[in-house]
């Protein structure tokens, strides 16, 4: 008799695919333009990044440090009316993009959150949710939760509007801070909170230091369902270099949770190549003409029209693993093992019951490395096979599809593999 | 159950003021969201403003934003809607309602669950 199916995990959206973050409506669009009804225009291009949820804004109207000029309830009329933004939520519904909406109050200002009136400010963010639920908004973002006095019982407040709406909503909390028990104590008291921090921001410089980090986290967390971004708001660029993007594209969308990104982190949007760009927030580059500041500033490679034609570029396979990533049984849920590889090397494998499996091999070194996979120190039910297909691999030149034998997998300088396996009884 | 009547309106030339009240009973009133709502002779009843039931969030429609002041005193479990500088296009059977669920209402009127019986404003030019 074949063995018992394993019983599906409840699966809400957010844990179907990643995360895209805009917070500059204007920089997003570019041009002088920077409005919801342009952003309507964009949605078929989230589509083509096959992310579940667009992470807006702010978009409320807020005066610099001044909360009585703060209002949650009204959209800056820089970014349209109300009815354009009804108008948004409807074209995303239909095209199946999520929309959450940020209510940090005090965006323009020094302290996110004012320094002073924290109780009024907390009752106009509480009003605001109930006033956005009810106009669709499937979710909100609040940031620089580290400057909000009694975070945790706040936020267990809002959790509770939010999920007494519908169990279908969700409540992102973004952080600056990096320490794992400053974080651990946000979660402790919110079950279904998603929170952003930046926590990997120091990852960037070896196998062995993010394997570390990535596994205290899971255990750390237990079986809470996370969310994985270098920072709250930041590109990645602002993190890396450029040669570990791909590594961390493939990384971030195979980690068990939901994968954040912020506008540009598919292209390697870098504000360090834009001269006198924000390196908060730097125009997106549409095309060579987005960034019209210093003629033959940009070329086509480093814009989402030249990426989209090259499939060998940062924008493919950002798509690519988008694609995977909402599709298979052992990336939506499956279960996580890592296991030594070798120095400078992080491996993983992801597997679902019977489900095809995942196993990733990242090459955070400057230099080619032979992985020594140790499968001894994976458990019976995640044992390796001698040969796993190649599905894809953050460098060019690899036969995809070929079969790779385990024992004697090499990686080039920062590659990253990901290679796939049947189930076997 | 909540009761609510309202009171305050009345026949006003354009440019004028009137204040409308809306008394409520029953069920506790500091836990509603408050609206206001209008209808116009052969047209649909439309949303005016909403008030959220600490009284720190307001919200208006277009139409009315700087004109009309929505406001509440829990205490006298009472709601008001400052009308200033109005227009003929006001005249309008005006409603109030309460929303049970939410702390803030919205501006769609499914989501009141109680309204009041209405009072008739008449703004001539």
């Known amino acids: 008799r074949a063995p018992r199916c394993r019983e599906l995990p409840a699966q809400k959206w957010w844990h179907t695919g990643a995360l895209y973050r805009i917070g500059d409506l204007q920089a997003f669009q570019g041009h002088g333009a920077g409005n919801l009804a342009g952003l309507k225009g964009r949605l078929d291009y989230l589509s083509s990044l096959k992310v579940k949820g667009l992470v807006l804004g702010p978009i409320h109207k807020n005066q610099k440090d001044d909360v009585a000029q703060t209002d949650l309830l009204q959209i800056d009329p820089n970014f349209g009316s109300k009815e354009d933004f009804d108008s948004l939520l409807q074209s995303a519904k239909k095209k199946s993009i999520r929309v959450i909406l940020d209510l940090t109050p005090n965006y323009r200002g020094e302290n996110s959150w004012f320094s002073t009136q924290v109780d009024t400010v907390a009752t106009k963010v509480k009003d605001a949710l109930e006033f956005w639920l009810q106009a669709g908004v499937d979710g909100f973002q609040v940031r620089d939760i580290e400057n909000l006095k009694d975070a945790s019982s706040f936020l267990a407040e809002w959790q509770n509007i939010t999920k007494g709406f519908s169990e279908d909503r969700l409540l992102i909390a973004g952080t600056n801070s990096s320490d794992l028990q400053q974080i651990l104590s946000l979660l402790e008291s919110n079950k279904d909170l998603l929170l952003t921090s930046s926590y990997l921001s120091d990852s960037g410089s070896t196998g062995e230091h993010t394997k570390s980090l990535v596994t205290q986290y899971l255990n750390a967390t237990g079986n809470r369902w996370c969310s994985w971004s270098l920072s709250q708001a930041r590109l990645l660029t602002s993190f890396l270099p450029a040669q570990l993007l791909r590594l961390y594209q493939l990384m971030l969308f195979t980690l068990p949770g939901t994968p954040v990104f912020s506008y540009g982190d598919e292209i390697g949007l870098d504000a360090a190549a834009l001269p006198g760009q924000p390196m908060e927030a730097p125009v997106m580059l549409w095309d060579e003409s987005s960034f019209p500041d210093i003629p033959g500033a940009v070329s086509a490679n480093m814009t989402v029209k030249g990426q989209s034609e090259d499939p060998g570029s940062l924008l493919s396979l950002f798509r690519r693993l988008s694609d995977q990533r909402s599709k298979e049984r052992s990336l939506l849920h499956g279960d996580f093992h890592a296991f030594s590889a070798g120095p400078g090397l992080f491996s993983y494998i992801r597997h679902w019951d019977q489900n095809e499996r995942f196993l990733v091999v990242l090459n955070f070194g400057d230099v080619g490395l032979s992985a020594g996979l140790q499968a001894s120190d994976l458990p019976a039910s995640a044992s390796l096979p001698a040969k796993a297909d190649l599905l894809l691999s953050t460098q060019p030149g690899r036969e995809e599809g070929s079969p790779l034998e385990l024992e004697r997998l090499k990686l080039e300088p920062h590659e990253g593999l990901l290679l796939r396996f049947p189930y076997a009884a | 159950q909540v009761q609510l009547v309202e009171s305050g309106g009345g026949l006003v030339q354009a440019g004028g003021s009137l204040r409308l009240s809306c008394a409520a009973s029953?069920?506790?009133?500091?836990?509603?969201?408050m609206g206001w709502f209008r209808q116009a002779p052969g047209k649909e009843r439309e949303f005016v403003a909403t008030i959220s039931c600490s009284g720190t969030s307001t919200y208006y429609a277009d139409s009315v934003k700087g004109r009309f002041t929505i406001s509440r005193d829990n205490a006298k479990n009472t709601v008001y809607l400052q009308m200033n500088s109005l227009k003929p296009e006001d005249t309008a059977v005006y409603f109030c309602?309460?929303?049970?669920?939410?702390?803030?209402?919205?501006?769609?009127?499914?989501?009141?669950?109680?309204w009041g019986q209405g009072t008739q404003v008449t703004v001539s030019s």
């Open positions: 029953g069920r506790a009133f500091s836990s509603n969201g």
């Open positions: 309602a309460a929303d049970t669920r939410h702390c803030m209402g919205y501006t769609k009127d499914e989501g009141y669950a109680y």
